[in-house]
């Protein structure tokens, strides 16, 4: 019992989740490309989800996609339209903690 407590204590000590940089608001022009960056780090490596206006982001082939990066995750929107306006939020979790950041796309 004592040793298992020590192991879990060590795991807790090594476990972390940090928002390294708040997401910026993005202003761009119709037809252009916008990129939103979710800069987080953690152990275990965090799972990152993207939301737009309170709902999970819908990926659109060749237009809207997100992918993991060395710093967290990047969401890219090509051929921007007025309908893309809104609040974009990334939510990262390492299984124990949760951090999030929100930016507005105009």
């Amino acid at each position: 019992p004592t040793s298992s407590w020590n192991i879990s204590s060590e795991l807790n000590k090594d476990s972390y989740l940090t928002l390294d940089e708040p997401m910026n608001n993005i202003t761009t022009s119709l037809g252009q490309t916008a990129e939103l960056h979710c800069k987080v780090s953690g152990n275990p490596p965090p799972t990152i989800r993207w939301f737009k206006n309170d709902a999970p982001v819908v990926q659109e082939p060749r237009r809207l996609s997100f992918r993991s990066t060395i710093y967290g995750s990047r969401l890219r929107i090509r051929n921007l339209d007025t309908t893309d306006t809104g609040y974009f939020q990334c939510v990262a979790t390492n299984g124990k903690e949760v951090v999030s950041s929100t930016g507005v796309l105009f």
Epitope: N53, D54, A55, V58, D84, V104
Partner: antibody, heavy 120, light 107 residues
Framework: EVQLVESGGGLVQPGGSLRLSCAAS????????IHWVRQAPGKGLEWVAA????????YYADSVKGRFTISADTSKNTAYLQMNSLRAEDTAVYYC?????????????WGQGTLVTVSS | DIQMTQSPSSLSASVGDRVTITCRAS??????VAWYQQKPGKAPKLLIY???SLYSGVPSRFSGSRSGTDFTLTISSLQPEDFATYYC?????????FGQGTKVEIK
């Protein structure tokens, strides 16, 4: 308590102008989009225009583009809808509304509405 | 443009009835659908957001659900104060699109 109070409605002739006001209180005005939504007598809800007061980004329905102008004064916590070249089909109750903070669109607070009648 | 097709346009029901209103989006809007209630001469009131989240202060007899691009508002046991017009709205693509409305009348 969040409050939105519209004013400025009334009877106006076709081709005339009117300016609606939406006075906001109880929340950080510059942190939210403000929308105008209208409802013609006996009809459904129609989005008209929106603005983000902190950035002055503006958006319009095609039906009002070029005729209506939305603006905001953050020092007065008030949004405006300047309506020019009014037509009979603009007759409606006009509501200003505020969305939830995490949404640009879903409207959780509405004003009481102000009636605009366009008639000769 | 995104279309929100709401049905039925009107229905008659009695107090205590279970009432279901549906809305179909013309393309995926994720879970970003809201439902509003409007009574004559009054502003709309938010009931449900994110397809199934009950807005603060709204009675638990109201619920929402999603199946793909189909969204449903259910009133489990209709009360006298529930006779009104209900609108769906997609909240994913700015500036949002409203359904045509469903008027719930007394049978």
């Amino acid at each position: 308590e969040v409050q939105l109070v519209e004013s400025g409605g009334g009877l106006v002739q076709p081709g005339g102008s009117l300016r609606l006001s939406c006075a906001a209180s109880g929340f950080t005005f510059s942190s939210y989009f403000i929308h105008w939504v209208r409802q013609a007598p006996g009809k459904g809800l129609e989005w008209v225009a929106a603005i983000h007061p902190a950035f002055s980004f503006t958006y319009y329905a095609d039906s009002v583009k070029g005729r209506f102008t939305i603006s905001a004064d953050t020092s007065k916590n008030t949004a405006y809808l300047q309506m020019n070249s009014l037509r009979a089909e603009d007759t409606a109750v006009y509501y200003c509304a505020r969305p939830r903070l995490s949404s640009a669109v879903v409207l959780d607070y509405w004003g009481q509405g102000t009636l605009v009648t366009v008639s000769s | 443009d995104i279309q929100m097709t709401q049905s039925p346009s009107s229905l008659s029901a009695s107090v205590g009835d279970r009432v279901t209103i549906t809305c179909r989006a013309s393309q995926s809007v994720s879970s970003a659908v809201a439902w509003y209630q409007q009574k004559p001469g009054k502003a709309p009131k938010l009931l449900i957001y994110s397809a199934s989240s009950l807005y603060s202060g709204v009675p638990s007899r109201f619920s929402g659900s999603r199946s793909g691009t189909d969204f449903t508002l259910t009133i489990s046991s209709l009360q006298p104060e529930d006779f009104a017009t209900y609108y769906c709205q997609q909240g994913y693509y700015f500036p949002g699109t409203f359904g045509q409305g469903t008027k719930v009348e007394i049978k």
